[in-house]
């Protein structure tokens, strides 16, 4: 078979939740290996994910470094096999990623209600605070750690015999709601970030209805 | 010119502990994986690790993970390997390498250690 | 971790005759590279990414092969070309050398 020339990455795209941080592009390599390059905008290109036939790179070890700082990365096409570079002077064909900046833009991950507990008319429903892949002095931070009053929960939640449903909002990860007595509710949850202009919500966590496992009730 | 400039050699008894030195020059030091490579005598090429400098970073072969430390001193563009536990069949030529794509190819002229008691 | 098994471990040729020498890898490798070491000497990037020669080595050499099985080609021996020669894997970690295979005046 005839030679053929390296191609160039391209669609490179930051797929990003809760901090876990993968670039992904194509095409599926024929004749050739890429190796990912990450770098802040004032520091180094350092070489990741080398010589590889994958078309997609975790990066996240280097962005929970410092998740509010904005990261470029660029996948690197090199010749493996019959192919001719066609980069110029031997240098190997690149492209670069947009900017990614891991505070601003990480998605949200579908949260967890963690319990719920009724006493009399009130219930407290708790947030399940998710463990995150951001280190600080050697012990991963939560999502509440990371994002502080800027991350906020909002509670849905609904009799279960009508389908009318109330909002209530927590900048902690837990609601304390009135209910009226007697009655079964359900309850969902949804994280967001008010001041973001993109990725501002999560999905809607799982359903949880009293009368199920998760609950507790007290006279 | 990229240069890197190792240590000289090593006489060490069975047991003792050595550090091998590796000065780059020539470039941004902290911007390339360093390779370290030994050689045994009449061998062929072992490939022992490489480190980040600007972070520290390693990748070790799980082969030397109880026994070899990568290190690096940015101040002073110097990359080390220490290997302690040393044993007769540590006797090797060892070599820093630069991390390069293509025909870039940098190389120390190796420091040989010779382990005997 | 991927053992690189080369052979011959000896190769006895003349200037002008042709060396073939083999690099056969214990599971699928897409990464491959050549050096070339004469005595005394450091290595010296030869042939990367299988096929590509390294700045400054002749035309008279070529490399090839995918999967499992790689060679390097030397089509007319001249004596500069006689040392050994080590193919290594960057495909996966921990990178892996072959045993070598020196090349040596008949």
């Known amino acids: 078979s005839g030679t053929t020339n390296t191609v160039a990455a391209y669609n490179l795209t930051w797929k990003s939740t809760n901090f876990k941080t993968i670039l992904e592009w194509e095409p599926k390599p024929v004749n050739q290996v890429y190796t990912v390059q990450i770098s802040t905008k004032s520091g180094d290109w350092k070489s990741k994910c080398f010589y590889t036939t994958d078309t997609e790179c975790d990066l996240t070890d280097e962005i929970v470094k410092d998740v509010k700082q904005t990261y470029l990365a660029r996948v690197f096409s090199y010749p493996a096999g019959n192919v001719e570079s066609t980069g110029s002077a031997g240098e190997p064909l690149y492209e670069n990623s947009p900017e990614f900046t891991p505070y601003l833009e990480t998605n949200l991950g579908q949260p967890t209600i963690q319990s719920f507990e009724q006493v009399g008319t009130k219930v407290n429903v708790t947030v399940e605070d998710e463990r995150t892949l951001v280190r600080r002095n050697n012990t991963f931070l939560s999502l509440r750690d990371v994002f502080g009053k800027d991350l906020i929960y909002t509670l849905y939640y609904w009799k279960s015999s009508s389908s009318g449903k109330k909002t209530a909002k927590t900048n902690t990860n837990e609601f304390l709601i009135d209910v009226d007595k007697g009655e079964n509710y359900c309850f969902s949850v949804q994280a967001v970030i008010p001041s973001r202009t993109v990725n501002r919500k999560s999905t809607d966590s799982p359903v949880e209805c009293m009368g199920q496992e998760k609950g507790e009730f007290r006279e | 010119q990229v240069q890197l400039v190792q240590s000289g050699s090593e006489l060490k008894k069975p047991g003792a502990s050595v550090k091998v030195s590796c000065k780059a020059s020539?470039?941004?030091?902290?911007?390339?994986?360093m390779n370290w490579v030994r050689q045994a005598p009449g061998q062929g090429l072992e490939w022992i690790g490489m480190i980040y400098p600007a972070d520290s970073e390693t990748r070790l072969n799980q082969k030397f993970k109880d026994r070899a430390v990568l290190s690096v001193d940015k101040s002073v563009s110097t990359a080390y390997l220490q290997i302690c536990s040393l044993k007769a069949e540590d006797t090797a030529v060892y070599y820093c390498a630069r991390e390069d794509y293509g025909s870039s190819d940098y190389w120390g002229q190796g420091t040989t250690v010779t382990v005997s008691s | 971790e991927i053992v690189l098994t080369q052979s011959p471990a000896t190769l006895s040729l003349s200037p002008g005759e042709r060396a073939t020498l083999s690099c056969s890898a214990s599971s699928s490798v897409s990464y491959m590279n050549w050096y070339q070491q004469k005595p005394g000497q450091s290595p010296r990037i030869w042939i990367y990414?299988?096929?590509n020669l390294a700045s400054g080595v002749p035309a008279r050499f070529s490399g090839s092969g995918s999967g499992t099985d790689f060679t390097l080609t030397i089509s007319s021996l001249e004596p500069e070309d006689f040392a050994v020669y080590y193919c290594q894997q960057k495909s996966s970690f921990p990178w892996t050398f072959g045993g070598g295979t020196k090349v040596e005046i008949k």
């Open positions: 020539g470039y941004s030091f902290i911007s390339y994986w």
């Open positions: 990414g299988i096929s």
